[in-house]
Amino acid sequence: LKGQEFAPSHQQVYAPLRADGDKPRAHLTVVRQTPTQHFKNQFPALHWEHELGLAFTKNRMNYTNKFLLIPESGDYFIYSQVTFRGMTSECSEIRQAGRPNKPDSITVVITKVTDSYPEPTQLLMGTKSVCEVGSNWFQPIYLGAMFSLQEGDKLMVNVSDISLVDYTKEDKTFFGAFLL
Amino acid sequence: LKGQEFAPSHQQVYAPLRADGDKPRAHLTVVRQTPTQHFKNQFPALHWEHELGLAFTKNRMNYTNKFLLIPESGDYFIYSQVTFRGMTSECSEIRQAGRPNKPDSITVVITKVTDSYPEPTQLLMGTKSVCEVGSNWFQPIYLGAMFSLQEGDKLMVNVSDISLVDYTKEDKTFFGAFLL
Amino acid sequence: LKGQEFAPSHQQVYAPLRADGDKPRAHLTVVRQTPTQHFKNQFPALHWEHELGLAFTKNRMNYTNKFLLIPESGDYFIYSQVTFRGMTSECSEIRQAGRPNKPDSITVVITKVTDSYPEPTQLLMGTKSVCEVGSNWFQPIYLGAMFSLQEGDKLMVNVSDISLVDYTKEDKTFFGAFLL
């Protein structure tokens, strides 16, 4: 996949060299979540803004029904931040009844769904115990890494508790991917 | 924007294909902040090291006066980590006078300034309540995502409390961007 | 390093334009750590899975003996997440004997080793005080940034306490790098 001194006498056949600007890319931003049915035994998936404000999809990377659709096989960098906020944490009561409770927790998972494969694949997980002394708390979980994806794969972001997601600002909670 | 088997009989006109190595890129690292004037109603902006140690700017990406200057329109991945440290947190006093106080918090914002647009745009925000039992605490906030920027845009990193930024090591607090 | 309208009358000599798909890339995932000797005065390095599950190395980026080997000079994006989990934190006892203790902490460092240079270089550090009231806690530290690396450089991930690393899932603790 190289082009070298492109004189007609060369015997090589050159594979297409694509410009960076036409690679599939998306940056999605938070919207207020509405109650929906979730898959059984799976954290609920967030839905996203894909065209207003900072959000965009381009070059055949499409967003539909909580999923980013991968239009082309290759290595993608995938990232998300979810900001959580809560009013209370039972943590100070953690030793009630003489034994430690499980602490509250917040979790973000970026999940890949491949139609030909029965189970979703968890690509990235950020999980944190929440044990705040104060009456209200807020904090982000950030994730990002590179994965080899196939055309037709679908990506979504799942969270442990949709009601704790801070949906108030597009810069606080977001999800994106781009072909490398 | 593709080049295929470059024989003279081809009718296509090929747009320039740029080498990856000549794309605008920067990685800036922390320096100790000195008291300066800040924009009104905006968190203070950090200033940065741009050429010593791990820091660099290249291919027309320049740093000046707390801003990274975007030399070319396109999609950029932008990231920052700020490590905060504090010696106290009022959180243990949070229920003083029978009512909960607002918890202390730490916030990082990556902001875009476009000269033709009156208001800065907040691209990324990481914000966290700080409610530490101990007398001293430290923790990072990391941010990173992709944005479509225009030539002439300026990027800066704002923080809620400049006095809490850990300036001691270039690997703890940093800011970068690169054209995809 | 550009190729434009490749007609035979052009006098330019075109440098090779490489396809994105043949750039060095790796994504490594956590495995259970076995006790090993550590370098003196240095946090222990993690070892990684490099071919099973989500893990891969490609295009001459190799993994050997806790190190990612950089096969080609250039600008790389490097990232890691380490999820820590602990059973207790002495933090609630922080005012024992009338004076504050140093808080517990967790630290991740991405380190570069250059054979011709005597000292490793710390590229990225995420460090956090841990002062949890509850009896068990867990949380991730994420890092990522761009660095100019040389062929032959080696990258590793060091942690403050290997016994606190959550090795149970490949999506919780990982390490990667790719040439931009």
Epitope: - | R32, H38, I162 | -
Partner: antibody, heavy 118, light 107 residues
């Protein structure tokens, strides 16, 4: 350039109160902690506490708790340190100081001499 | 509270000479130590922060080193204007505390 200008010298009787002011200029007053440090004649430096001008939050050294109050007026970029129930060993030069980080003070006021004498 | 012990409490030296002042903390303070110079009737002046970083505008003959509990301030080639009192100050944990001072006198 950054400047901290303190109020003039004071002479007070034991049991009285003193309020020292510190007017800041050349930087964003609300962006940086203001420390108060005192120095008794011929003695070393003693840190008293700080105020965060943005929120008005304070932290005082235990020794001064209940006797000291640090306040600010952001409209005139001024910090205040009030010390009550003065004793003769409160005779000292009182300094305000600020800096770009919590850990060290780049800029200091000229000092205010407070004499407590009956 | 963290105690800082400076030594010596006073030292005499000649112009052009070299002097080292030490500061010992009662517990580990990492690198959170600053050094100040104070001349009679004047406010202190920051010389060194984070144990070894030279404050802008301070001559390079001043240097700091150390971490943990043991720190030093070195003046490599004494100038007449360097004769003053020097204080260390920790900022690892609340409350901030100062050392007792070292008076540098001309020999």
């Amino acid at each position: 350039q950054v400047q901290l200008v303190e109020s003039g010298a004071e002479v007070k009787k034991p049991g009285a109160s003193v309020k020292v002011s510190c007017k800041a200029s050349g930087y964003t007053f609300t962006g940086y902690y203001m420390h108060w440090v005192r120095q008794a004649p011929g003695q070393g430096l003693e840190w008293m506490g700080w105020i965060k001008p943005k929120s008005g939050g304070t932290n005082y050294v235990q020794k001064f708790q209940g006797r000291v109050t640090m306040t600010r007026d952001t409209s005139i970029n001024t910090a205040y340190m009030e010390l009550n129930n003065l004793k003769s060993d409160d005779t000292a030069v009182y300094y305000c100081a600020t800096g770009g980080s919590q850990d060290a003070s780049d800029f200091w006021g000229q000092g205010t001499m407070v004499t407590v004498s009956s | 509270d963290i105690q800082l012990t400076q030594s010596p409490s006073s030292v005499s030296a000649s112009v052009g000479g070299r002097v080292t002042i030490t500061c010992r903390a009662s517990q580990d303070i990492s690198i959170w130590l600053a050094w100040y110079q104070q001349k009679p009737g004047k406010a202190p002046n920051l010389l060194i922060y984070a144990a070894s970083s030279l404050q802008s505008g301070v001559p390079s003959r001043f240097s700091g080193s150390g971490s943990g509990t043991d720190f030093t301030l070195t003046i490599s080639s004494l100038q007449p204007e360097d004769f003053a009192t020097y204080y260390c100050q920790q900022a690892d944990s609340f409350p901030l505390t100062f050392g007792g001072g070292t008076k540098l006198e001309i020999k």
